[in-house]
Interface confidence: low
């Protein structure tokens, strides 16, 4: 019966001991709701059939209603195209007319909505971009579409979602779904795995020079991962770059220039959607002295007929610390002359007339003397005791 | 374009291993995420394996994990796919696939997401 029952229970003991109930019954019969007011609020899924490319309606109610004109079985109205409404009666034994009109508003096809990857690739290490993206077109009105994301514990209500301040090598799940008329018809999942990050900077441990043209750099590998390291090094304005393996721990640097300063960079970078430079570890050294090169452009012109005006150029290369000019001056084997200036500009005066000289001009750098320059030049007569004629030699 | 042609397979015993290869030609191969789906007799096709651009990345179906192993050699242009400690029920005809949506966020395990497919392989594990 559709009647509603209204029951009171008495119970009393029976001289057993056991429990006799005894009820009675008052028969009311209250008046049925209608069916519109009973599914005023019915909700509806839309469930998409991919080769017939039409949608099943699934209407969200606890018993078994019939649907008018429109054959529904099991609560599901079937075969309907998309973005075209479709009117739906609906009755139940529980309810009295009217009937419940409902008029389903169909979604579009869901292979016209296509998840997209937005993330920039510079950016992939530490952001992802998600988006909704319309390939084809149809004739819903688009106002009516809203999407929702879900990530971790972060709901949004837009097409695109970017997420930033991500860690790297992370894997994050993102659900999505498109609703119509507020009525879901589509939803989709991503796992994403964040790029690689850049890796840490790594720890130099030494950074020092032991010889002239020699320097040497050890350190320890930064903790994320890598695939190889770039070691510079610059004196002055050149700058010389090396891609080292990534197991090594040590460089040792060849042919330096003597007595400079070279300034290290060392980073680590990994090849990932791009390449990825992680910071540089920074350190310099001084590499130690050596000879300086050979002074040149040495001339040695008389001023007198026993003295001598000697001038050179620098080295090219100083490989020290100080500037000093040596000029010697010798006869046969013998030393006769040892000057040091700082300049090389000698003047040698009161020399023997008509004698031979050897004449060495170095530089010294205040560690090392450099090669000497050798030119040969001899005095002449003495003009002033013989006013009957001169003699050049 | 990518074409890919797939190697190995084969009938196995219950317990034993195989290799399946997957050798791409056409363009570079290292822009592209690869994955290994199959398809049993009157089954719908399943998510096996999966592994992004770089090798840095890769995916397994929970029947599988720890007895396959997807790898790729990018130099070789060629993916594969370990397979260990094979079962009866890992009798299927295994494809391999490619597709070219890297950045980030394909869904690796989704079959229609992929572009280019090989022409498949049969593997028979018989108890």
């Known amino acids: 019966s559709d009647a509603y029952l209204n029951a009171s229970e008495t119970t009393t003991l029976s001289p057993s001991g056991s429990a006799v109930i005894s009820t009675t019954t008052i028969a009311t019969t209250p008046s049925k709701p209608t069916c519109d007011e009973k599914y005023a609020n019915i909700t509806v899924d839309y469930l998409y059939n991919k080769e017939t490319k039409l949608f099943t309606a699934k209407l969200n109610v606890n018993e078994n209603v019939e649907c008018g004109n429109n054959t529904c079985t099991n609560n599901e109205v079937h075969n309907l195209t998309e973005c075209k409404n479709a009117s739906v009666s609906i009755s139940h034994n529980s309810c009295t007319a009217p009937d419940k009109t409902l008029i389903l508003d169909v979604p579009p096809g869901v292979e016209k909505f296509q998840l997209h990857d937005c993330t920039q690739v510079e950016k992939a290490d530490t952001t992802i971009c998600l988006k909704w993206k319309n390939i084809e077109t149809f004739t819903c009105d688009t106002q009516n579409i809203t999407y929702r994301f879900q990530c971790g514990n972060m709901i949004f209500d837009n097409k695109e979602i970017k997420l930033e301040n991500l860690e790297p090598e992370h894997e994050y799940k993102c659900d999505s779904e498109i609703l119509y008329n507020n009525h879901k018809f589509t939803n989709a999942s991503k796992i994403i795995k964040t790029d690689f990050g850049s890796p840490g900077e790594p720890q130099i441990i030494f950074c020092r020079s032991e010889a002239a043209h020699q320097g040497v750099i050890t350190w320890n590998p930064p903790q994320r991962s890598f695939h190889n390291f770039t070691l510079c090094y610059i004196k002055e304005t050149e700058k010389d770059c090396l891609n080292l393996d990534k197991n090594l721990i040590k460089y040792d640097l060849q042919n330096l220039k003597p007595y400079t300063k070279y300034v290290l960079s060392l980073h680590a970078y990994i090849i990932a959607k791009v390449q990825r430079n992680g910071s540089a570890a920074m350190c310099h050294f001084t590499t130690k002295s050596a000879p300086p090169s050979q002074v040149w452009n040495m001339t040695v012109s008389m001023t007198s007929d026993n003295s001598m005006h000697v001038k050179c150029r620098p080295p090219r290369d100083r490989n020290g610390p100080h500037e000093r000019y040596h000029l010697e001056v010798e006869a046969g084997n013998t030393l006769v002359r040892n000057e040091s200036h700082k300049n090389c500009d000698f003047r040698v005066k009161d020399l023997q007339y008509s004698t031979d000289y050897t004449f060495k001009a170095y530089f010294h750098n205040g560690d090392y003397p450099g090669e000497p320059f050798i030119l040969h030049h001899s005095t002449s007569y003495n003009s002033k005791a013989h006013h009957h004629h001169h003699h050049h030699h | 374009q990518v074409q890919l042609q797939q190697f190995g397979g084969g009938l196995v015993q219950a317990g034993g291993s195989l290799r399946l290869s997957c050798a791409a030609s056409?363009?570079?191969?290292?822009?592209?995420?690869m994955g290994w789906f199959r398809q049993a007799p009157g089954k719908e096709r399943e998510f096996v394996a999966a592994?992004?651009?770089?090798?840095?990345?890769?995916y397994y179906a929970d029947s599988v994990k720890g007895r396959y192993t997807i790898s790729r050699d990018n130099a070789k242009n060629t993916g594969y796919l370990q397979m260990n400690s094979l079962k009866s029920e890992d009798t299927a005809v295994y494809y391999c696939?490619?597709?070219?949506?890297?950045?980030?966020?394909?869904?690796?395990?989704?079959?229609?997401?992929?572009?280019?497919w090989g022409q498949g392989t049969l593997v028979t594990v018989s108890s």
């Open positions: 592994i992004n651009w770089s090798g840095g990345s890769t």
């Open positions: 056409g363009r570079t191969f290292s822009g592209y995420a």
């Open positions: 696939a490619a597709s070219d949506w890297v950045v980030g966020g394909i869904s690796l395990m989704n079959g229609a997401e992929y572009k280019y």
